[in-house]
Interface confidence: low
C-alpha cells in the first residue's frame, strides 16, 4: 500500500470488470488499477466483491470484509484470462444478486459499483446493461463507470448514475493509474467524526457529522443521518444542511446516561446506509454545565 489518500467509509464496493477479448493484452493494467484502488478502501466495515464479465458474468470474489480473502481475490483476479463478448449486463446481474441477498436481514449496507469497460456496447447489449444497472440502482447502489479506449461516453452516462459518475480514460489502459485519485475522491463516502461526540442525556442537540462525499447522492434531499441506539433501535433524522464534507443533523434525545448511538448516513432516504465506527454517547450534565 503506497499511502496517500484513503477512504474510511463502511459500505459494499463492487468492481465489475470487462474481461472480453478486446482487453486481452491490457489485463495487467486493469488488474493493477483495481489492486491499487482496492488498497485505498481501509475501513474494517468495508466489504468488497470482484465480478468479471465477458460472454458470462462471474463473481470471482463474493462480498467480504476479510482482508486475507481480498488478497486471495486479487490473486485470482490477476490470473484471469480475457476472452469473449462484452455482456456487461451479466456483471450487473451478479452485483444485484449479492446486493439483495447480502442485505435481506432488513438492514441494508450502501452499495457502490465501479464498472470498467472498453469499447462500445451494441444495441441490445447496451439496452440490457442499462436495464441491469437500473435494477442495481433500484436496490440502492451508486453506479460509476470507467471507460477506456473505444468506449461510448453517452452510453456510459446512462449506465452510470449520471455523466458525473463516468470516468473517461482516453489515453488508453496505461492511463488508468491517473484516475485512481479522482475515483477515490468521488466514490468514497465516509463518516470521520461527530461533534459533539458526547451529549447530555435528555437534552436536544445538533450534531455536526464530519466526513466526505455527502453530496455524491443522486438527490441531496434524500440524505439522512441515522443513529443506531444501543445496537437496537435506529432513528433517522433529516439533516438541516448537506455539504460535501459535513452534515448538520438534529440528534435524537437520548434519555439515559451511558446510551450509545452509532452514526450512519443514508444517501437514499433510508434504503441503505454507510456505516462508521463513530459513536455518540450520553453523559449526565448538571444545570451549570
Amino acid at each position: 500500500e503506497d499511502g496517500g489518500p484513503a477512504c474510511y467509509g463502511g459500505f459494499d464496493l463492487y468492481f465489475i470488470l470487462d474481461k472480453s477479448g478486446s482487453v486481452l493484452h491490457h489485463w495487467n493494467e486493469i488488474y493493477y488499477f483495481v489492486e491499487q484502488l482496492a488498497h485505498k478502501f481501509i475501513s474494517p466495515q468495508l466489504r468488497m466483491s470482484f465480478i468479471v464479465f465477458s460472454t458470462r458474468g462471474t463473481t470471482l470474489m463474493k462480498l467480504t470484509e476479510d482482508r486475507e480473502q481480498i488478497r486471495q481475490g486479487l490473486e485470482e483476479l490477476q490470473k484471469v484470462l480475457p476472452g469473449g463478448d462484452t455482456y456487461m449486463h451479466e456483471g450487473f446481474e451478479r452485483a444485484s444478486e449479492q446486493i439483495y441477498y447480502e442485505n435481506r436481514q432488513g438492514y441494508r449496507t450502501a452499495s457502490v459499483i465501479i464498472a470498467l469497460t472498453d469499447g462500445e456496447l451494441h444495441e441490445d447489449l447496451f439496452f440490457y446493461s442499462e436495464r441491469e444497472a437500473n435494477r442495481s440502482r433500484d436496490l440502492g447502489a451508486i453506479v460509476y463507470c470507467v471507460g477506456v479506449k473505444d468506449f461510448n461516453e453517452t452510453q456510459l452516462a446512462r449506465i452510470a448514475d449520471s455523466k458525473d459518475h463516468v470516468f473517461p480514460v482516453n489515453d488508453g489502459f496505461q492511463a488508468l493509474q491517473g484516475i485512481i485519485h479522482s475515483i477515490l475522491k468521488k466514490s468514497c463516502i465516509e463518516i470521520l467524526a461527530a461533534e459533539p461526540s458526547t451529549i447530555c442525556a435528555g437534552e436536544s442537540f445538533q450534531v455536526v457529522v464530519r466526513g466526505n462525499g455527502f453530496r455524491h447522492a443522486r438527490n441531496v434531499d434524500r440524505v439522512l443521518c441515522s443513529f443506531k441506539i444501543n445496537d437496537s433501535v435506529t432513528l433517522n433524522e433529516k439533516p438541516f444542511s448537506v455539504e460535501d464534507t459535513y452534515l448538520l443533523c438534529p440528534a435524537p434525545i437520548l434519555k439515559e446516561v451511558g446510551m450509545k448511538a452509532a452514526l450512519q448516513v443514508s444517501m437514499n432516504d433510508g434504503l441503505s446506509f454507510i456505516s462508521s465506527s463513530v459513536i455518540i454517547t450520553t453523559t449526565h450534565c448538571s444545570d451549570g454545565s
Epitope: R56, E90, R135, D138
Partner: antibody, heavy 118, light 107 residues
C-alpha cells in the same frame, strides 16, 4: 426444442424431506438459470429458487434454510430438496428455465403433484 | 418482498369481446413485469415479457402495457381457447413474486 421433466415421489410424510429431479433436454444446464416454482392448491405461484449455469444457487428467503438446489451436469439434471415438510408444502412443483438476460420463465416442465400427509 | 396484486379476481367475458386485466406492484419495478396464461392441469405459459414485449408464437390479440407499479394485459378479442387464469410476475427484485391471478371465464 427445450423440454423439462420433473420426477420424484408424489407422497411425502410430514417432517421428512421432499426430493425432486428435473431432467433437461434440448439445452445444457451449463447455460441459463434453472428454477423451481410451486403452486399450492388454490394459491398463487411461488418462486422457490434457482441454480445458475455456474452452479450458484439463490433461494426464496421465505423457505429459510429448508431448501437445497443441486445439479448433475453429466446427466443434465438439477434437483430440489425441501427439508422438514409440513402439509403446507403440498403443491404442484414445476421446474422452469429463465435465460441469462431476462427474468421471465420461458420454458416450464408439466409439473408434478406432491402431497405431504401421514 | 414485492407484492403483486391482480384485479379483478374473476372476469366474465363473452367470446369476441375485449378483456382488460390489471396488475399492481407494491413498489416501482420499472418494466420488469411478465404475464403468463395457465389452463387447468397445465404449466403456465409465457405471454408477454418486460411489460409489453410480445413472444413469437403468441397471438397478436395479447398485448401488455404499463411501467412502474401499474400494468395491464389486454386481450383484444377473446377466443374460446383464451379462457384461463392469467398471472403477472415481478421480474425486478428477488424473490421473484407472482400475482394472485385473474380467472377469465365465459360469460
Amino acid at each position: 426444442e427445450v423440454q423439462l421433466q420433473e420426477s420424484g415421489p408424489g407422497l411425502v410424510k410430514p417432517s421428512e424431506t421432499l426430493s425432486l429431479t428435473c431432467t433437461v433436454t434440448g439445452d445444457s444446464i451449463s447455460s441459463d438459470y434453472w428454477n423451481w416454482v410451486r403452486q399450492a392448491p388454490g394459491q398463487r405461484l411461488e418462486w422457490m429458487g434457482y441454480i445458475s449455469y455456474s452452479g450458484n444457487t439463490y433461494t426464496n428467503p421465505s423457505l429459510k434454510s429448508r431448501i437445497t438446489i443441486n445439479r448433475d451436469t453429466s446427466k443434465n439434471q438439477f434437483s430440489l430438496q425441501l427439508n422438514s415438510v409440513t402439509p403446507e408444502d403440498t403443491a404442484v412443483y414445476y421446474c422452469a428455465r429463465y435465460k441469462t438476460i431476462t427474468s421471465m420463465f420461458d420454458v416450464w416442465g408439466q409439473g408434478t403433484t406432491v402431497t405431504v400427509s401421514s | 418482498e414485492i407484492v403483486m396484486t391482480q384485479s379483478p379476481a374473476t372476469l366474465s367475458v363473452s367470446p369476441g369481446e375485449r378483456a382488460t386485466l390489471s396488475c399492481r406492484a407494491s413498489q416501482n419495478i420499472r418494466d420488469f413485469l411478465h404475464w403468463y396464461q395457465q389452463k387447468p392441469g397445465q404449466a403456465p405459459r409465457l405471454l408477454i415479457y418486460y411489460a409489453s414485449q410480445s413472444i413469437s408464437g403468441i397471438p397478436a390479440r395479447f398485448s401488455g402495457s404499463g411501467s412502474g407499479t401499474d400494468f395491464t394485459l389486454t386481450i383484444s378479442s377473446l377466443e374460446p381457447e383464451d379462457f384461463a387464469v392469467y398471472y403477472c410476475q415481478n421480474g425486478h427484485s428477488f424473490p421473484y413474486t407472482f400475482g394472485g391471478g385473474t380467472k377469465v371465464e365465459i360469460k
